[in-house]
Interface confidence: low
């Protein structure tokens, strides 16, 4: 039976089927290659993900901009990294200087991604509303060379931006982009060019499900450790390696290793192979001290006694991921190479307080 | 046994760029649990965390300057660095780095064990 | 942030004085506590860590306890060397914060 006579690829995805020496046990007998704007297995998802400005995934490190503007005897700094959408506080977005007269704010993604649309808002300085009455959008593979997006003129398209300092306004891309690097440029405003913002889209490969973890699909007698720690020595009160899903909640909600050492970790057994595109992280708390993994490296296996430690592409070595700085937000770490295994160990290289652990895997 | 010296520009001014150096000895910081930590105290006033940095070249940053900050170490010469980047008359103050050490792991603690003498940094127009 | 704050900014007390400095953290910090000295030459000295351990050649004089959020520093007899200034930290998270001092002079 052929399988893509009955297509199971959504949204205009196209099937192609997977002959069975390539296939083995790592693929199922088809695959999808989805149309721009759309992701996931079979194409079924609609790429409007928000890609992490609000929730922290984008680090501030990814976060560029022309200029900043510093008010109040130096000591208010509108920095970039601000510039996030439903951001609060007093200072609490990106602001240009204003002798700034191209100014621009820049995302680097880290990898190439589709980018489907910019979720914008203004802010307050002193009781006045700051924010972009309109903008223009452009993107880069490279953070070079920059296209802005066009409209049916084929000129620059100006995008509709805002009407008050707090009101979120989308705009979505006729078309999706692939990019690296975005860049919005403010090209009129209100009072001065005020922003906090997001950035929509999706995966490029569409690989990028949740395993398993958080929502229990994968079982408990599947996620293994080194060690377990044990509160004042007691197996009632022991932190196991199933306890180590992303956002679990309750008293023992995460995975802490038993003793300090970088020959800890903690194993996910797939069940069968799958490709593994990325994690995401998570510390916990232990009686209100904070925990977590600040970095740590990833081994994965096929057979569970020869493990290979995924390897830096430009460095050749193994890889040290950055991790997480609190107990409870999400660091998410996309593999640039996909891994293709049915095991995979995380191993913590550097800790705050106690080696603990919730997280999911990635992959498809 | 263990000795840390900060060093760097006893004078800025304003918008310039401070770099300090903490040089080291009797440790690695390529020995696993081990850390520099840079901490201020401005004159008569008490210590704020700047900075630190862990032995796998991890760093972590005091929100309220991360934007102003750097910090980075050399490990075959056993020295960490930190800039910050522009100074105010606000960054005058003493400046000392600090080891990081972990205790026994059932605590899951470490502490600042040992420390420099410090250095004094003026920034003035 | 966690604020810790000691309330006694200075304290005077006679050689041979059984002294407790205080420090308050603004929520619970499961002993995830050191204590410094700072010498008046700018000195700084780890004394006692995750509450109440004492650091390797501190005197057994000093001692710490405490719990939650309220701990305290306690020297069983004061020595005309301890004239210094204590500060607490808190450990539990990030940032690392200090309390302001505490100065112990001679009477």
């Known amino acids: 039976l052929d399988i893509c006579s009955k297509n199971p690829c959504h949204n205009g995805g196209l099937c192609e089927e997977i002959s069975q020496e390539v296939r083995g046990d790592v693929f199922p007998s088809y695959t999808c290659t989805c149309l721009k704007g759309y992701a996931g297995n079979h194409c079924e998802t609609k790429c409007v993900e928000p890609l992490g400005l609000e929730n922290g995934n984008i680090a501030n490190s990814q976060i560029a901009a022309s200029s900043v503007r510093v008010t109040f005897l130096g000591l208010q700094h509108w920095v970039p990294e601000l510039a996030r959408l439903n951001r609060a506080g007093m200072v609490n977005a990106w602001t240009p200087s204003s002798n700034d007269d191209n100014p621009w704010i820049q995302v680097n993604l880290l990898r190439r991604m589709w980018v489907t649309g910019v979720v914008t808002q203004g802010a307050s300085r002193l009781a006045s509303h700051e924010y972009l009455k309109a903008f223009k959008v452009a993107y880069s593979l490279n953070g070079h060379e920059f296209d802005f997006i066009h409209d049916v003129n084929k000129k620059h398209k100006e995008f509709v931006g805002n009407w008050n300092k707090n009101a979120v306004h989308v705009n979505l891309f006729e078309t999706p982009v692939e990019a690296q690097y975005v860049r919005l440029y403010p090209t009129s405003c209100h009072t001065a060019c005020t922003l906090r913002f997001e950035l929509l889209g999706c995966e490029l490969n569409g690989c990028a499900n949740p395993l398993g973890l958080k929502n229990n699909s994968i079982p408990d007698k599947q996620i293994t450790a080194s060690s377990s720690y044990k509160t004042w020595g007691l197996h009632l009160f022991s932190w196991n390696p199933s306890y180590a899903r992303l956002d679990k909640q309750g008293n023992f909600n995460a995975w802490v290793a038993g003793s300090y050492g970088n020959d800890q970790w903690l194993q996910v057994d797939l069940g069968s192979s799958k490709e593994v595109t990325g994690i995401i992280t998570q510390g916990a708390r232990n009686f209100g001290s904070v925990q977590f993994v600040a970095s740590y490296k990833v081994a994965y296996s096929n057979d569970s006694a020869n493990w290979t430690e995924y390897q830096d592409p430009r460095t050749g070595s193994s890889k040290i991921f950055p991790g997480n700085w609190d107990n409870h937000s999400h660091k998410k770490n996309l593999f640039e190479t996909p891994i293709l295994a049915r095991y995979v160990r995380i191993l913590p290289v550097a800790w705050h307080n106690r080696i603990a652990l919730r997280l999911e895997l990635l992959g498809c | 046994q263990v000795t840390l010296k900060e060093s760097g520009p006893t004078v800025l001014k304003p918008t310039q760029t401070l770099t300090l150096t903490c040089s080291f000895s009797?440790?690695?910081?390529?020995?696993?649990?081990?850390?520099v930590i840079w901490i201020r105290q401005p004159s008569g006033a008490g210590l704020e965390w700047l900075a630190q940095?862990?032995?796998?070249?991890?760093?972590r940053y005091n929100p309220s300057l991360k934007s102003r900050l750097t910090i980075t170490k050399d490990t075959s010469k056993n020295q960490v660095f930190l800039t910050i980047t522009p100074v105010d008359t606000a960054d005058t103050a003493t400046y000392y780095c600090?080891?990081?050490?972990?205790?026994?792991?059932?605590?899951?603690?470490?502490?600042?064990?040992?420390w420099g003498q410090g250095t004094t940094v003026t920034v003035s127009s | 942030d966690i604020q810790m704050t000691q309330t006694t900014s200075s304290l005077s007390a006679s050689v041979g004085d059984r002294v407790t400095i205080t420090c308050r953290a603004s929520?619970?910090?499961?002993?995830?506590l050191n204590w410094y000295q700072q010498k008046p030459g700018g000195a700084i000295k780890l004394l006692i860590y995750?509450?109440?351990r004492l650091h390797s050649g501190v005197p057994s004089r000093f001692s710490g306890s405490g719990s939650g959020t309220d701990y305290s520093l306690t020297i069983s007899s004061l020595e005309p060397e301890d004239i210094a200034t204590y500060f607490c930290q808190q450990g539990n998270t990030l940032p690392l914060t200090f309390g302001q001092g505490t100065k112990l002079e001679i009477k």
């Open positions: 600090a080891r990081r050490t972990f205790y026994d792991y059932d605590e899951g603690f470490y502490a600042m064990d040992y």
């Open positions: 929520q619970d910090i499961s002993n995830y």
């Open positions: 009797g440790f690695s910081l390529s020995t696993s649990g081990l850390g």
């Open positions: 940095i862990y032995w796998d070249d991890n760093k």
């Open positions: 995750y509450a109440s």
